[in-house]
């Protein structure tokens, strides 16, 4: 059964023609898979800093290091992509700073798909100097773990030399890699010592070994490919918003709710109200009134503006956001002061946001 009773029918239809939601665009930090990333929390005078990723508390682990105002991610993978926040808790208030991390490598193995520089990897030897295969550009082979989003193109390279010119073949998980082993096959560019797989899928995960050999020897190098799938997620609300506020009778006030959602979000502003002198219905559920929701007649739905407030407007205001996957909500309190008291913006240390996960 519903966890509240609505005072009035709040049908959400018809909905406005939706637009792609891009609210409160935070700073973006980009890293390639395998790289390390260090971000400094850009908040001043922080006594205690806590970190979240996609609304979930972030603690230290073998790849995540939290030291003071610094967050370090070692050996980043696309799974590390997301919306991060650092919250500085001080004695009198708290503040949150948001940033995005995007770990992606559309063309893997550190160079452009066109391989414009590839010819230099094809080393010509003096015919008299017989030589076993050797690597000519180990820098392009340093990154062994390639974590790539599904549908991207991956390139593995093993630039080599030798005399006579070595041949190159590829193994997947230690066995001969055949074209029929993947839908769409793959490309081998011998002159660039590269293997290219387009539009990777989870079944492409595994170890890929280049074997470079001639009659004088054989060398090999193994890459590990992880194909990371994105999945839609529930809305994420910026921690600490909406913020508690106070104003005098007759004053104006604004509550702001910042939303991160890749599926179309539906935003509602809800207030606890009384009906017939009671805050709760016969079923014991609180009476709630929808003050505003994203729809045809609704302007900027992330902002709830209250004008010429009265004492009756005091209370808890809930920002509730839903997409087809799930929900999130957070609330703030409005304090309405008598006219003789000067209004002040009230910032309190906020507890962990009420994510519904």
């Amino acid at each position: 059964r519903p966890s509240f009773s609505l005072v009035e029918d709040t049908t959400l239809e018809p909905e406005e023609p939706p637009t792609k939601y891009q609210i409160s665009q935070p700073e973006v930090y980009v890293a390639a898979p395998g790289e390390s990333l260090e971000v400094r929390c850009l908040l001043k005078d922080a006594a205690v800093i806590s970190w979240t990723k996609d609304g979930v508390h972030l603690g230290p682990n073998n790849r995540t290091v939290l030291i003071g105002e610094y967050l370090q991610i070692k050996g980043a993978t696309p799974r590390d992509s997301g919306l991060y926040a650092c919250t500085a808790s001080r004695t009198v208030d708290s503040e949150t700073w948001y940033f995005m991390v995007n770990v992606t490598d559309a063309i893997s193995s550190g160079d452009d798909e066109d391989d414009t520089d590839g010819a230099e990897d094809f080393v010509s030897e003096n015919s008299n100097n017989k030589r076993a295969p050797y690597w000519t550009n180990t820098e392009k082979m340093e990154k062994r773990l390639h974590a790539v989003p599904a549908a991207n193109t991956v390139k593995f390279r093993c630039p080599a030399g030798g005399n006579p010119m070595p041949t190159m073949r590829w193994l997947k998980n230690g066995k001969e890699f055949k074209q029929e082993h993947r839908i769409g096959g793959y490309k081998v560019r011998n002159q660039h010592w590269s293997l290219i797989m387009e539009s990777v899928v989870p079944s492409d995960k595994g170890n890929y070994t280049c074997v470079v050999e001639n009659e004088y020897g054989s060398i090999n190098h193994t890459y590990h490919l992880d194909v990371v799938e994105r999945s839609p997620h529930r809305p994420i609300l910026q921690a600490g918003l909406p913020a508690n506020a106070s104003t005098v009778v007759g004053g104006d006030v604004e509550f702001v709710c910042k939303v991160y959602s890749d599926a179309q979000p539906h935003i509602q502003w809800i207030k606890h109200v009384e009906k017939n002198g009671s805050k709760y219905g016969p079923d014991g559920l609180p009476y709630l009134k929808v003050l505003k929701h994203s729809g045809i007649n609704s302007s900027n739905a992330e902002v709830l503006a209250l004008f010429n407030v009265t004492e009756a407007d005091a209370g808890e205001y809930i920002c509730k956001v839903s997409n087809y996957i799930g929900q999130a909500n957070q609330s703030a309190w409005l304090t309405v002061l008598p006219k003789q008291q000067a209004p002040g913006r009230e910032k309190e240390i906020t507890a962990s946001p009420d994510y519904l996960e």
């Epitope: 519903p2 239809e13 909905e15 637009t19 839609p232 890749d262 599926a263 997409n323 996957i325």
Partner: antibody, heavy 113, light 106 residues
Framework: EVQLVQSGAEVKKPGASVKVSCKAS????????MHWVRQAPGQGLEWMGA????????NYNQKFKGRVTLTRDTSISTAYMELSRLRSDDTAVYYC??????WGQGTTVTVSS | AIQLTQSPSSLSASVGDRVTITCSAS?????MSWYQQKPGKAPKLLIY???NLASGVPSRFSGSGSGTDFTLTISSLQPEDFATYYC?????????FGQGTKLEIK
């Protein structure tokens, strides 16, 4: 492994009600909307409504409002769809689905006098 | 309610063919999902958020589009791809589906 397992086929008379269950396993039932979609024989898919198990929030397709009731029992991770005042054109396969990528196997409801 | 109109309603094609199905919305949308359904089975998600491949879906399926016009493309038809395909919008209540495109073997 995520599974949505629905109750078995039902045969009902016009004017009666039917209640279909959908038991979820392999994921956190309360964290995702449970949608109900139906498909009449040889026809397309039609969204009926959805329930958010954590708090019981419901969104209905206005076409079914007043006839469909969505409920859930979080203690057994099960959602229910009840359709009342059945008519012959309610004969269909009824599916529960969550996140768009988890689907039940479907429950066939036949309305016949 | 936002109406979704798929074209064509039915289509005959051969293994190896490239096939495109379009979905036109009566109002602008942010995203589109695409499903495949075989007789007697539940729909299977192929594409979400217009262009993202769902888990376990072969890379020969792709989605694109924006606003009112969206497309599902199968780059090289395989025998198991003969089925009915539906577009769906999750953006605006009530959520709606296209009428379906039946893909048959030529």
């Amino acid at each position: 492994e995520v599974q949505l397992v629905q109750s078995g086929a039902e045969v009902k008379k016009p004017g009666a009600s039917v209640k279909v269950s959908c038991k979820a396993s392999g994921y956190t039932f309360t964290n995702y909307w449970m949608h109900w979609v139906r498909q009449a024989p040889g026809q397309g898919l039609e969204w009926m409504g959805a329930i958010y198990p954590e708090n019981g929030d419901i969104n209905y397709n206005q076409k079914f409002k007043g006839r469909v009731t969505l409920t859930r029992d979080t203690s057994i991770s099960t959602a229910y769809m009840e359709l009342s005042r059945l008519r012959s054109d309610d004969t269909a396969v009824y599916y529960c689905t969550s996140r768009g990528d988890y689907w039940g196997q479907g429950t066939t409801v036949t309305v016949s006098s | 309610a936002i109406q979704l109109t798929q074209s064509p309603s039915s289509l005959s094609a051969s293994v190896g063919d490239r096939v495109t199905i379009t979905c036109s919305a009566s109002s602008g949308l942010s995203y589109m999902s695409w499903y495949q359904q075989k007789p007697g089975k539940a729909p299977k998600l192929l594409i979400y958020d217009t262009s993202n491949l769902a888990s376990g879906v072969p890379s020969r399926f792709s989605g694109s589009g924006s606003g009112t016009d969206f497309t599902l493309t199968i780059s090289s038809l395989q025998p198991e791809d003969f089925a009915t395909y539906y577009c769906q919008q999750w953006s605006s209540y009530p959520y709606t589906f296209g009428q379906g495109t039946k893909l048959e073997i030529k």
